[in-house]
């Protein structure tokens, strides 16, 4: 009688992560008597995948009933496949021996390849805010995909970026891979509403790439421009001075009025108006009683924005001259107001 052969008809099997892999194996004879075992890998370090008589293999089921007297189908199914299951699987026939069963013949092996989707890309920006014209770095990470081939693109407001570096790790063979990319983005004053997008394309995604986003509102700081103007006289001895704080982001802002270097009032921006580009405007009024001053008055509007060093703008109020409109007459767009009387 012809000697038993162990036949593994599939050289390779490709399975998506989470699915069930079927590894086929048949024997050509019932003799010699002894069990079939499945291993991953060959040699002394091989891993036991299934033993039909002994051991706990909760993920493995047999395709046919191995207890049937003339069964020669030793195919198995492995459930809930992960990238860690990739490798070459061998169906091995043993013959009964003492004390241990003896390996008799092995199949040629079936290579199991696992396709695993990349995780959702996570985009992270710089730890500290930066101002327009500065270049900032964004990183994008995605993990757990297989095979290694992957495409990553960066976009800002739908426009593809070109200044980025990407690494896929590890370099050699692995059960799964990770991608890490760093993109450089130049900020502009209009970027409050901008988004940076990292897009990952992989064979497992069927042409529907994964995207990770970062809002530049978390990254940008647009410093305010200040304008101090004297408004027309309200009363014979009162002058109204306004400080217009324009185009700033984020909203966190504190304003201090100084009269001849002395603090007269401090307030926090509350009722701001928002511009189309996402920046804010705010206006503060100061009512100055001119009759209380003998000399000219230097009024200073000092603004501390988002914890940065204060910026200021001054206005000289001539007490000797008859109060009249001085300074810029520029109309402020979308300005709110905040009025206080100083006596």
């Amino acid at each position: 009688e012809e000697e038993l052969q162990v036949i593994q008809p599939d050289k390779s099997v490709l399975v998506a992560a989470g699915e069930t892999a079927t590894l086929r194996c048949t024997a050509t004879s019932l003799i010699p008597v002894g069990p079939i075992q499945w291993f991953r890998g060959a040699g002394p370090g091989r891993e036991l995948i299934y033993n039909q008589k002994e051991g706990h293999f909760p993920r493995v089921t047999t395709v046919s009933d191995l207890t049937k007297r003339n069964n020669m189908d030793f195919s198995i199914r492995i459930g809930n496949i992960t990238p860690a299951d990739a490798g070459t699987y061998y169906c091995v026939k043993f013959r009964k021996g003492s004390p241990d069963d003896v390996e008799f013949k092995s199949g040629a092996g079936t290579e199991l390849s696992v396709r695993a989707k990349p995780s959702a890309p996570v985009v992270s920006g710089p730890a500290a805010r930066a101002t327009p014209q500065h270049t900032v770095s964004f990183t994008c990470e995605s993990h757990g995909f297989s095979p290694r081939d992957i495409t990553l693109k960066w976009f800002k407001n739908g426009n593809e970026l070109s200044d980025f570096q990407t690494n896929v790790d590890p370099v050699g063979e692995s059960v799964s891979y990770s991608i890490h990319s760093t993109a450089k983005v130049v900020l502009t004053r209009e970027d409050v509403h901008s988004q940076v997008i990292c897009e990952v394309a992989h064979v497992t995604l069927q042409g529907d790439p994964l995207r990770g986003t970062a809002n530049l509102s978390e990254t940008i700081r647009v410093p305010p421009t200040l304008e101090v103007t004297q408004q027309p006289v309200r009363a014979e001895n009162q002058v109204n001075v306004t400080c217009q704080v324009r185009k700033f982001y984020p909203q966190r802002l504190q304003l201090t009025w100084l009269e001849n270097g002395n603090v007269s009032r401090t307030e926090t921006a509350s009722t701001v108006t928002e511009n189309k580009d996402g920046t804010y405007n705010w206006m503060s009024w100061l009512l100055v009683n001119v009759s209380a001053h003998r000399d000219d008055v230097k009024l200073t509007c000092q603004v501390e924005h988002d914890g940065q060093p204060a910026v200021s703008k001054s206005h000289d109020l001539k007490v000797s001259a008859h109060p009249k409109e001085q300074g810029s007459n520029t109309a402020a767009e979308n300005t709110g107001s905040n009025e206080r009387n100083i006596y």
Epitope: V33, P44, G45, R46, E47, L48, Q52, K53, E54, G55, H56, F57, D65, L66, T67, K96, P99, D100
Partner: antibody, heavy 114, light 108 residues
Framework: QVQLVQSGAEVKKPGASVKVSCKAS????????MHWVRQAPGQGLEWMGR????????KYNPKFQDRVTMTVDTSTNTAYMELSSLRSEDTAVYYC???????WGQGTTVTVSS | EIVLTQSPGTLSLSPGERATLSCRAS???????LYWYQQKPGQAPRLLIY???NLASGIPDRFSGSGSGTDFTLTISRLEPEDFAVYYC?????????FGGGTKVEIK
């Protein structure tokens, strides 16, 4: 569900034999080996041997080779372990264990005393 | 035969502490064939970990196993009151199958 139900406690005299049964249900009895493990009072676990219910093939721990016999009755899905020439040090709880090592019988206490 | 030596024999710890149990084999054991059990008084042993590092069904993830060759470890990251018991390692790599002598984890 899988169950291994063992026979009740036994008291035996030195030199006698004891036969412990283990009735299986909830799985294909011929699928896997059936092992027998014992545990003397306050001691660890000791593997005695195993039987393949599909063909009656046995492997015994050399320590018990001359005194133990394992058999099965596939018509009733029952495994048996017989230990002869009992001595006081054979006083123990005897467990049958399915080949997957997950399912254990409740244990049978065998006391050997003169 | 492969002799499995467990240490320490007794481990006295408080709930919440980390337990590290060792099992040393007299000759190399393929990791697929090294199992751990938990046994409480008056009960049959319960399979805890199979193939060195895989948790059996229903076993909480505070239990973990590691090792290869001749040195294997069972770790309980944070002891719960129900974890105080005796733990056995077991090999079925070669005949005769053998068990370690056990480690008793007791309340300090």
């Amino acid at each position: 569900q899988v169950q291994l139900v063992q026979s009740g406690a036994e008291v035996k005299k030195p030199g006698a034999s004891v036969k412990v049964s283990c009735k299986a249900s909830g799985f294909n009895f011929e699928d896997t080996y059936m092992h027998w493990v014992r545990q003397a009072p306050g001691q660890g676990l000791e593997w005695m041997g195993r039987i393949d219910p599909a063909d009656g093939d046995t492997k015994y721990n050399p320590k018990f080779q001359d005194r133990v016999t394992m058999t099965v009755d596939t018509s009733t899905n029952t495994a048996y372990m017989e230990l002869s020439s009992l001595r006081s040090e054979d006083t123990a709880v005897y467990y049958c264990v399915r080949g997957n090592y997950v399912n254990w019988g409740q244990g049978t206490t065998v006391t050997v005393s003169s | 035969e492969i002799v499995l030596t467990q240490s320490p024999g007794t481990l006295s710890l408080s709930p919440g502490e980390r337990a590290t149990l060792s099992c040393r084999a007299s000759s190399s054991v393929s990791s697929s064939y090294l199992y751990w059990y938990q046994q409480k008084p008056g009960q049959a042993p319960r399979l805890l970990i199979y193939s060195t590092s895989n948790l059996a069904s229903g076993i909480p993830d505070r239990f973990s196993g590691s090792g290869s060759g001749t040195d294997f470890t069972l770790t309980i990251s944070r002891l719960e009151p129900e974890d105080f018991a005796v733990y056995y390692c077991h090999q079925w790599y070669s005949y005769p199958r053998t068990f370690g002598g056990g480690t008793k984890v007791e309340i300090k």
